[in-house]
Amino acid sequence: HTAAQDNCTCPTNKMTVCSPDGPGGRCQCRALGSGMAVDCSTLTSKCLLLKARMSAPKNARTLVRPSEHALVDNDGLYDPDCDPEGRFKARQCNQTSVCWCVNSVGVRRTDKGDLSLRCDELVRTHHILIDLRHRPTAGAFNHSDLDAELRRLFRERYRLHPKFVAAVHYEQPTIQIELRQNTSQKAAGDVDIGDAAYYFERDIKGESLFQGRGGLDLRVRGEPLQVERTLIYYLDEIPPKFSMKRLT
């Protein structure tokens, strides 16, 4: 099952071009920008999604304190280099030969340098903290109901096994979702927490990546959960390497 056979579309990625030219006339979908074939039964990697986005027309209770090594994606959008599996290449460069090293979610983890910059390996982001602030409601959400609904959402919509949702914290109006996935834990076929977090982020912003589905309608016991702010922190298996001048 790679794509919807009846009308040849990609349910998990609307930024694709699909045609029935696969083996035996099966529907096959390729990501915009890279032209890489994607598996439409699961989430597309963040690298291919970013590449597609850059190629598209422009109109198109106890809270966790992020550690000193937590990264926030301050650089925003760029046109990434992806490897043949669709993962981010460890070294990214722009058109002006400025280069930097990224982690597995594509967030810069070193100072910028020139073409001589070396990035020996793609460092895995093993812990993601999604920090949400919800709009005022009549009362606080029940913590266990919120936990259950968010776990259900990540399992059913983003195909992430709940064992990778380490915790859901709630201190009204702040919700924190902790995703954790060590290299040793991730089996073949498991959705990467970085990809799940990216799909969730785009859903929350009203920019769903899913084909022809309604946007995200998050409800806890029937009460709408409307998010007004999102901040995502990324923690890598190896701490990032920035010079002191960045910290001042």
């Epitope: 998990t12 259950a148 259900r152 064992k163 990778f164 834990q185």
Partner: antibody, heavy 119, light 111 residues
């Protein structure tokens, strides 16, 4: 209230196929995946696989791969499990069970469908 | 596959007494403090019924004489004061890893 109602008992010959249905009500069908579990007479429970009602694709227990197909019809909120090349040791009660909210527990079960394989 | 071993296979307890069923798992089902272990009750001619999820959480509507404990590889289901309606077969189940597996079952009877 949440209900899973399964189709009636079946008697099949060895080598034949059987298709069991599971009609859901009382909740949004596409919000929860459906699992299939079987129980041979006097024996324990055996997980066969799970189908995503949202995406329509399934993950099967390796033991049944190639013989089982799980499908859904969202227009009628019904899940189906088809088992092919039946053998006498496939005689069992077949249950559908819904995933619970947070931890992949099975919170609601169908009443079961008895499938007897006999020549 | 993860193997679940329940003990004992059968158990006879007097009404009002405590009943304890154990489940040992071949590998840990703990993920960041969340144990993907559940307990079900099955009465003759009926489907299983969820009692406990995530090792120790009581399912809605289940009497509080039922409780679950344990983590990692060793888990326990306890009925604090046995009632006549508790006569059934009890199963543990892991949902940490596909294929999901069940224990062989423990038959609980009244002494």
């Amino acid at each position: 209230q949440v209900q899973l109602v399964q189709s009636g008992a079946e008697v099949k010959k060895p080598g034949a196929s059987v298709k069991v249905s599971c009609k859901a009500s009382g909740y949004t069908f596409t919000d929860y995946s459906i699992n299939w579990v079987r129980q041979a007479p006097g024996q324990g429970l055996e997980w066969m696989g799970v189908i995503s009602t949202y995406y329509g694709d399934a993950s099967y227990n390796q033991k049944f791969k190639g013989r089982v197909t799980m499908t859904t019809d969202t227009s009628t909120s019904t899940a189906y499990m088809e088992l092919r090349s039946l053998r006498s040791d496939d005689t069992a009660v077949y249950y559908c069970a819904r995933y619970g909210d947070g931890y992949n527990q099975f919170d609601y079960w169908g009443q079961g469908t008895m499938v007897t394989v006999s020549s | 596959d993860i193997v679940m071993t329940q003990s004992p296979d059968s158990l006879a307890v007097s009404l009002g007494e405590r009943a304890t069923i154990n489940c040992r798992v071949s590998e840990s089902v703990d993920s960041y403090g969340n144990n993907f272990m559940h307990w079900y009750q099955q009465k003759p001619g009926q489907p299983p019924k969820l009692l406990i999820y995530r090792a120790s959480n009581l399912e809605s509507g289940v009497p509080d004489r039922f409780s679950g404990s344990g983590s990692g590889t060793d888990f326990t289901l306890t009925i604090s004061s046995l009632q006549a309606e508790d006569v059934a077969v009890y199963y543990c189940q892991q949902s940490y890893e596909d294929p999901y597996t069940f224990g062989q079952g423990t038959k609980l009877e009244i002494k």
